[in-house]
Interface confidence: low
């Protein structure tokens, strides 16, 4: 057969949908790969072809579409499950052609099982929400298309298990979740179903995502740097090992890529001769706020070393700090010697 | 001294496959992001694609997205571009640069240091 | 996608010259641009970082200034050996890109 552009199979898209619910699936070709639409590959005279490969085994075949109730249809560059059974789990390709063109991409579709409480092996989205910040809601995510806007689903949210009723601060308004006060406690699971009606029938759409409180921007602050420090010296003599640790604290901002590092005499520690390690680690408040530490080693310190300039720098979307360690040599201590007789005892 | 050094270019035909390394030598590889940058014959620079100093990240030019992976051995201290499905446009010379210094982002995240060039034709 | 526009493609000075070469970013990018020099059948050599920081061993006439969206590259007294092609790049996150390079030559 003439070549094909293959996309390979495209991970990066990891699609998983629950068992005995609908899913509709698009084409990846034209959201990533291609710079046209299905449109104008249909006016250009393109077909798109289905096929799969079911888990476990090498043989690509095509879709079956012509199952009782069309279970499995296709709508322009859209395939549908209506619903999906435990057994469609494969990797799915698309391919778009006509007798002088051919481009095609695979895609890897898990179907997965969900108990009574809604917990399954599906990787959740997480929403952030601002603690003490004021009404923030959630809204239920990937129902569009789904159905027309002339029908009126029934939407029930959970948390975890349990129906929201009559809950302090959550309230469920239609395919929105609001919570006038976001506290810690309002940490956790949150599952929205979706029921709707479609040609005599009864399809229910659940999707959970996970609700982290994290630190309002109200209360950011730029970096704080609590070592080094203007109280602590490091005095060392030579041979000794030199430790320094350089710990920062960062407001949570969403989307801010928190950065800590050490400058000597005004260079990366990589491009200076001697033999310094940096270790790196890292803690989370419950609100996310973050404290990095790097701690700069050198084994054996000289006197050289000794009079560089050691300068932690930290930065986030809020600012840029820095903060210069007071390092010293060790001024070895005078020697006295002690005349025990001098001026003492008889004469 | 601190060296990278690009290698595994030459033709290929369009919709073929090629790896190209990079070998770099003179630093702490394991400890910097690189970079694949690239230069149609007589054209300006074009930026490739991104990979962390522990593999954690990877970004890529919309252009090549789907088609190109990028990849490091710290180990052998060498960076990789595998290039699938590959078209004509992709021909250029490609560069390797050392890119940001872990544990500083953005602070050091300039090109300052880069390969002489592999250079890639994909002609049928 | 931050476009970068750089202007002009191309000028012709005298030795001894002022060179002024703009670049814009389609979005603010900070202080996030790097300067390059490229000469002919050569790999790129890095100028300037973090808008107006010169590379140690880069010769002074070299300068950069700008935030945000406009840069400008500043060669104070051009030489013979200043004749390249000069990119500028965005490295605030990816995608990293290039403007479309200010070639540079001898009147």
């Known amino acids: 057969s003439e070549r094909c552009d293959d996309w390979g199979l495209d991970t990066m898209r990891q699609i998983q949908v629950f068992e005995d619910e609908p899913a509709r699936i698009k084409c990846p070709l034209f959201e990533h790969f291609l710079k046209f639409n299905y449109s104008t590959a249909h006016s250009a005279g393109l077909t798109l072809i289905w096929y799969w490969t079911r888990q476990d085994r090498d043989l690509e075949e095509p879709i079956n579409f012509r199952l009782p109730e069309n279970r499995i249809s296709k709508e322009k560059d859209v395939l549908w499950f209506r619903p999906t059974l435990l057994n469609d789990t494969g990797n799915y390709t698309c391919m778009l052609r006509n007798t002088t063109y051919c481009s095609k991409v695979a895609f890897p579709l898990e179907v997965v099982q969900k108990d009574s409480c809604f917990n399954s092996p599906m990787k959740l989205p997480v929403h952030k929400l601002y603690i003490e910040y004021g009404i923030q809601r959630i809204t239920c995510p990937n129902v569009d298309g789904y159905f027309p806007s002339s029908v009126k689903p029934t939407i029930t949210w959970y948390m975890g298990c349990y129906k929201i009723q009559n809950f302090n601060n959550v309230i469920p308004e239609g395919m929105n979740l609001s919570f006038l006060i976001a506290l810690i406690s309002n940490n956790g699971n949150y599952t929205c179903v979706v029921t709707y009606p479609e040609n005599g029938r009864t399809f229910h759409l659940t999707r959970t995502l996970t609700v982290k409180v994290v630190g309002s921007p109200k209360n950011a602050v730029p970096p704080v740097i609590h070592s080094p420090n203007d109280h602590v010296v490091y005095e060392k003599e030579p041979g000794e090992e030199l430790l320094i640790p350089c710990t920062v604290y960062f407001s949570f901002l969403m989307d801010s890529r928190n950065e800590v590092w050490w400058t000597i005499d005004g260079k990366k520690p990589d491009d200076i001769t001697i033999d310094v390690t940096i270790n790196e680690s890292i803690s989370h408040s419950r609100t996310e706020d973050e404290t990095r530490t790097q701690i700069l080693s050198i084994k054996k310190v000289t006197s050289e070393d000794l009079k560089r300039s050691y300068v932690c720098h930290a930065r986030s979307a809020k600012g840029e700090v820095a903060k210069a360690a007071k390092v010293k040599q060790k001024v070895p201590a005078p020697r006295y010697t002690v005349e025990l007789a001098c001026g003492f005892g008889a004469t | 001294q601190v060296q990278l050094v690009e290698s595994g270019g030459g033709v290929v035909q369009p919709g073929r496959s090629l790896r190209i390394s990079c070998a770099a030598s003179?630093?702490?590889?394991?400890?910097?992001?690189m970079h694949w940058v690239r230069q149609a014959p007589g054209k300006g620079l074009e930026w490739v694609a991104i990979i962390w100093h522990d593999e954690s990240y990877k970004y890529y030019v919309d252009s090549v997205k789907g088609r190109f992976t990028i990849s490091r051995d710290n180990s052998k201290n060498t960076l990789y571009l595998q290039m699938n499905s590959l078209r004509a446009e992709d021909t250029a010379v490609y560069y390797c640069?050392?890119?940001?210094?872990?544990?500083?982002?953005?602070?050091?995240?300039?090109?300052?240091?880069w390969g002489q060039g592999t250079m890639v034709t994909v002609s049928s | 996608d931050i476009q970068m526009t750089q202007s002009p493609s191309s000028l012709s000075a005298s030795v001894g010259d002022r060179v002024i070469i703009t670049c814009r970013a389609s979005q603010g990018i900070s202080n996030y641009l790097a300067w390059f020099q490229q000469k002919p059948g050569k790999c790129p050599n890095l100028l300037i970082y973090a808008a107006s920081t010169l590379r140690s061993g880069v010769p002074s006439r070299f300068s950069g200034s700008g935030s945000g969206t406009d840069f400008t590259l500043t060669i104070s007294s051009l030489q013979p050996e200043d004749v390249a092609t000069y990119y500028c790049?965005?490295?605030?996150?990816?995608?990293?890109?290039f403007g479309q390079g200010t070639k540079v030559e001898i009147k």
């Open positions: 790049q965005k490295y605030n996150s990816a995608p990293y890109t």
């Open positions: 003179g630093f702490t590889f394991r400890s910097y992001g």
């Open positions: 640069a050392r890119g940001d210094y872990y544990g500083s982002g953005s602070y050091y995240d300039a090109f300052d240091i």
